[in-house]
């Protein structure tokens, strides 16, 4: 998977009036990494692993960048014309990626009340707008404002692309993220299901990177997909991931079943506890 940095900013309006403050989160390689603390005007690391990425850095640049982006987004929301009564949100998601072949990608997406209405490839500066008439109207509104704003020139988009990649590279250079492997802890549990059946659950936790194979086997053969239930691979807040797989089996046949795990070239099997 490519390394990625993802900025997620949200601003709100109430009855057409843009609210002060904004919400901001940054994800690094899919993990919650930074959160903007509005009360203290500070970018705060999310968990120990995030602190480890930049050691004793003050996060002053991240703080200022997020604050500037938040102000920009509030100004953009103020220029959306069709704001009805009640609560509305404008969200900007900006992502940059560095792939294994060192190629890069950057994009920016705008959502109004949770609906995507404008995207831009920051490398080619190509805009795309969904087909709906609402999206078209919103996109025209925002693009007109961005054109008027002197900051949103060609060089500005190039800088957004370059800055995102520069930050991503800086985080990767810390060595905490780059090419690290944390093997999963695997735990198998059982619980009573319907009469004569039990549910067995295999949990893998605290692993990195996120790619993992976790499946139930019967007599050494993987069960079919439709007889197993999988959980999503989710960040656990410590810079690592967690997931699970469960299946229902007949009581008394536990010894025939094992949980098979494969991660970063290593694999293991785990029996059902008796």
């Amino acid at each position: 998977e490519p390394h990625s940095l993802r900025y997620n900013l949200t601003v709100l309006s109430w009855d057409g009036s843009v609210q002060s403050g904004f919400l901001a989160e940054v994800h690094l390689d899919g993990q919650p990494f930074l959160r903007y603390d509005r009360q203290k005007c500070r970018a705060k690391p999310q968990g120990q692993w995030a602190e480890d990425v930049l050691g004793n850095k003050t996060w002053d640049r991240e703080t200022r960048d997020l604050t500037g982006n938040g102000k920009d987004l509030r100004m953009t929301l103020a220029h959306i014309k069709d704001q009805k009564e009640g609560l509305h949100s404008l969200q900007e998601i900006r992502v940059c990626e560095i792939h294994e072949d060192n190629s890069t990608r950057s994009s920016q997406h705008f959502y109004y009340d949770g609906e995507l209405f404008l995207s831009q490839n920051l490398e080619t500066e190509e805009w795309t707008v969904p087909q709906s008439s609402r999206a078209q109207t919103l996109a025209m509104n925002v693009r007109n404002f961005l054109k008027e704003d002197a900051m949103k020139t060609k060089t500005h988009y190039h800088a957004m692309h370059a800055d995102c990649l520069q930050e991503l590279r800086r985080y990767l250079e810390s060595g905490v993220v780059l090419r690290r492997t944390v093997p999963p802890m695997v735990n198998v549990t059982r619980s009573e299901a319907s009469e004569g059946n039990i549910t067995v659950t295999c949990r893998a936790s605290s692993f990195y990177p996120r790619n993992i194979i976790l499946t139930w086997r019967q007599d050494g053969v993987s069960l079919s997909h439709d007889t197993q239930q999988w959980g999503d691979v989710l960040p656990d807040g410590n810079g690592t991931y967690q997931t699970w797989v469960a299946t229902r089996i007949c009581r008394g046949e536990e010894q025939r079943f094992t949980c098979y795990m494969e991660h970063s070239g290593n694999h293991s099997t785990h029996p059902v506890p008796s």
């Epitope: 203290k40 003050t58 002053d60 604050t67």
Partner: antibody, heavy 117, light 107 residues
Framework: QVQLQQSGADLVRPGASVRLSCRAS????????MNWVKQRPGQGLEWIGM????????RLNQKFKDKATLTVDKSSNTAYMQLSSPTSEDSAIYYC??????????WGQGTSVTVSS | DILLTQSPAILSVSPGERVSFSCRAS??????IHWYQQSTNGSPRLLIK???ESISGIPSRFSGSGSGTDFTLTINSVESEDVADYYC?????????FGAGTKLELK
């Protein structure tokens, strides 16, 4: 306008703790970090630490962790710094300064502390 | 801790001259440098933030430049009221640190 009013000069005995105050006005006290900075006579500036009045979160320079205690009183918009077991090394002017994105944009007039027996 | 080295310790110039103060960081701090002026018996005053950003109320003759490890504060036409000590401060790494200062004198 933003003002930081610091307490008057203090003459303290070695070993007797001293508490300096910094009263803020002209802005929302609980929205900004407050820094404390030391300046010995004829010397440069040294950052002691900062405190956020909203919940008293503190970030201290490790050099001062056993020397300085930062507190605030939100009801009076006042920040305090207590210096424990002062010695002649602690004789200095101490400034409070409002934080703006890690810069210090407004400064108090300073409090002179002299440690002498 | 980041060490900030300011040079020279004393600068002596004539009114109307252009003068530059140097601040060198012991490691890359990107643009996280700020400049302060402290007149005799006065409190420090913020002049420039983040290497080159101007501060409202500060005369336009003050400007800043640099990134990485080398930074410069420039006064493009010195006036008598500029006689003071000048300090740089970094905000990239805890703890925040200041340079030892450069004293500006008039010839």
């Amino acid at each position: 306008q933003v003002q930081l009013q610091q307490s008057g000069a203090d003459l303290v005995r070695p070993g007797a703790s001293v508490r300096l105050s910094c009263r803020a006005s002209g802005y929302s006290f609980t929205n900004y970090w407050m820094n404390w900075v030391k300046q010995r006579p004829g010397q440069g500036l040294e950052w002691i630490g900062m405190i956020h009045p909203s919940d008293s979160e503190t970030r201290l320079n490790q050099k001062f962790k056993d020397k300085a205690t930062l507190t605030v009183d939100k009801s009076s918009n006042t920040a305090y710094m207590q210096l424990s077991s002062p010695t002649s090394e602690d004789s200095a002017i101490y400034y409070c300064a409002r934080d703006d994105f890690f810069t210090m944009d407004y400064w108090g007039q300073g409090t002179s502390v002299t440690v002498s027996s | 801790d980041i060490l900030l080295t300011q040079s020279p310790a004393i600068l002596s110039v004539s009114p109307g001259e252009r003068v530059s103060f140097s601040c060198r960081a012991s490691q890359n701090i990107v643009t996280s440098i700020h400049w302060y002026q402290q007149s005799t018996n006065g409190s420090p005053r913020l002049l420039i933030k983040y290497a080159s950003e101007s501060i409202s109320g500060i005369p336009s003759r003050f400007s800043g430049s640099g990134s990485g490890t080398d930074f410069t504060l420039t006064i493009n036409s010195v006036e008598s009221e500029d006689v003071a000590d000048y300090y740089c401060q970094q905000s990239n790494i805890w703890p925040l640190t200041f340079g030892a200062g450069t004293k500006l004198e008039l010839k």
